[in-house]
């Protein structure tokens, strides 16, 4: 195994908001993260990034500076928080995502995470894409794995 | 002072398992890992496996094919190896020692049981 | 595996003489983080190994400096300058970068 392993677990939670004047969306979606240290020493995480993509298009983007030192043979389970916008040209999703008519409103989001980890003055960066499912028409909390899309051309990690 | 006591001697009948233990004493249990090592009579040292008490992570020697399983126990600070299945080629005397580390580094096994043995015999 | 080999297999010495242990890894034994973790240890009968070197060349504490260890990539070394009767027994080197870590075989140091 390689000496850092990341793995993207999935949506824990999706929150949502709307602003009906301007027809836009706001989701505020953490993910959890698990960072396994395969190495004799303890490594520091010195940062996380993450964006979301939605249709191509970025929707939100976060970062997490100082988060934490896993000991050896340790694995941490972080959580994340992305907020994202769903608006202007994509406006047209706010019909979707406040359709009474239909239950659930899934939307498919591209999620890419970028974990980076210093070695003497050097840095490492392993990055994950993951697509998932969100519901943009309520808050939702998930059992993990629960919102994993079909992600056919993301070949396990 | 660090000390680190392995449990007695074991005279077990082939095909059976026993757990040998490792107390540590002096120091932090957590902040160190633990490793166990076999010696056959009259032979050389071989790794047998390490593990994270403060995590229970391990990492093991493949060649001993599952033959041991590594724990700990945090509130007792006691380290524990199982051997499964056992046959003649595991009598020997087996080793817990302390390895500690630090970001990006880690030393070397600077204290040790006094070793366990196990007899493997009908 | 990464294989150790030590030679000699035995070394007798005369008290006051001095000796050399060599160890050849079978691959470079450099660790990710750029530190090559070779330690040396000392088993006397009947007793539990004791560390003696570690990371090649760092006397661990309360070992005598008439030990010494030098070498890089795959080829090691274990010097005692003038052996006493307190240093005989089974020499070890283990190389702590590649799973399953290994030994080597051991050098009996004992009177000629």
């Known amino acids: 195994p390689r000496s850092i392993d990341v793995k993207y677990i999935g949506v824990k939670s999706a929150y949502v908001s709307y602003d009906v004047q301007k027809r836009t969306i706001y989701l505020n979606i953490t993910n959890t993260l698990n960072i396994t240290n395969n190495n004799y020493y303890s490594v520091e995480v010195e940062n996380i990034t993450a964006q979301v993509q939605f249709a191509k298009t970025v929707i939100g983007k976060a970062r997490l500076n100082n988060i934490t030192h896993i000991g050896p043979l340790d694995m941490k389970q972080i959580d994340y928080t992305v907020p994202t916008v769903i608006a202007e040209e994509m406006s047209y999703m706010y019909d979707f995502c406040t359709l009474i008519s239909i239950k659930v409103h899934n939307i498919v989001l591209m999620m890419q995470v970028t974990v980076t980890t210093t070695y003497f003055g050097h840095s490492e960066q392993i990055s994950q894409e993951r697509y998932q499912y969100v519901d943009c028409g309520r808050n939702t909390t998930y059992q993990l794995g629960q919102s994993e899309y079909l992600n056919v051309l993301q070949p396990q990690q | 002072q660090v000390q680190l006591q392995q449990s007695g001697a074991e005279l077990v009948r082939p095909g059976t398992s026993v757990k040998v233990s490792c107390k540590a004493s002096?120091?932090?249990?957590?902040?160190?890992?633990i490793e166990w090592v076999k010696q056959r009579p009259g032979q050389g040292l071989e790794w047998i496996g390490v593990?994270?008490?403060?995590?229970?992570?391990?990492k093991y020697n493949e060649k001993l094919k599952g033959k041991a399983t590594l724990t700990a126990d945090k509130s007792s600070s006691t380290a524990y190896m199982q051997l499964s299945s056992l046959t003649s080629v595991d009598s020997a005397v087996y080793f817990c020692a302390r390895r500690g580390y630090t970001i990006y580094d880690f030393y070397a096994m600077d204290y040790w049981g006094q070793g366990t043995s196990v007899t493997v015999s009908s | 595996d990464v294989l150790m080999t030590q030679t000699p297999l035995s070394l007798p010495v005369s008290l006051g003489d001095h000796a050399s242990i060599s160890c050849r890894s079978s691959?470079?034994?450099?660790?990710?983080?750029?530190?090559?973790?070779l330690e040396w240890y000392l088993q006397k009968p009947g007793q539990s190994p004791k560390l003696l070197i570690y990371?090649?060349?760092n006397r661990f504490s309360g070992v005598p400096d008439r030990f010494s260890g030098s070498g890089s990539g795959t080829d090691f070394t274990l010097k005692i300058s003038r052996v006493e009767a307190e240093d005989l027994g089974v020499y070890y080197c283990f190389q702590v970068s590649h799973v399953p870590f290994t030994f080597g075989s051991g050098t009996k140091l004992e009177i000629k």
């Open positions: 691959q470079s034994i450099v660790y990710n983080n750029g530190n090559t973790y």
């Open positions: 990371k090649v060349s």
């Open positions: 002096g120091y932090a249990f957590t902040n160190y890992l």
């Open positions: 593990i994270n008490p403060g995590s229970g992570g391990t």
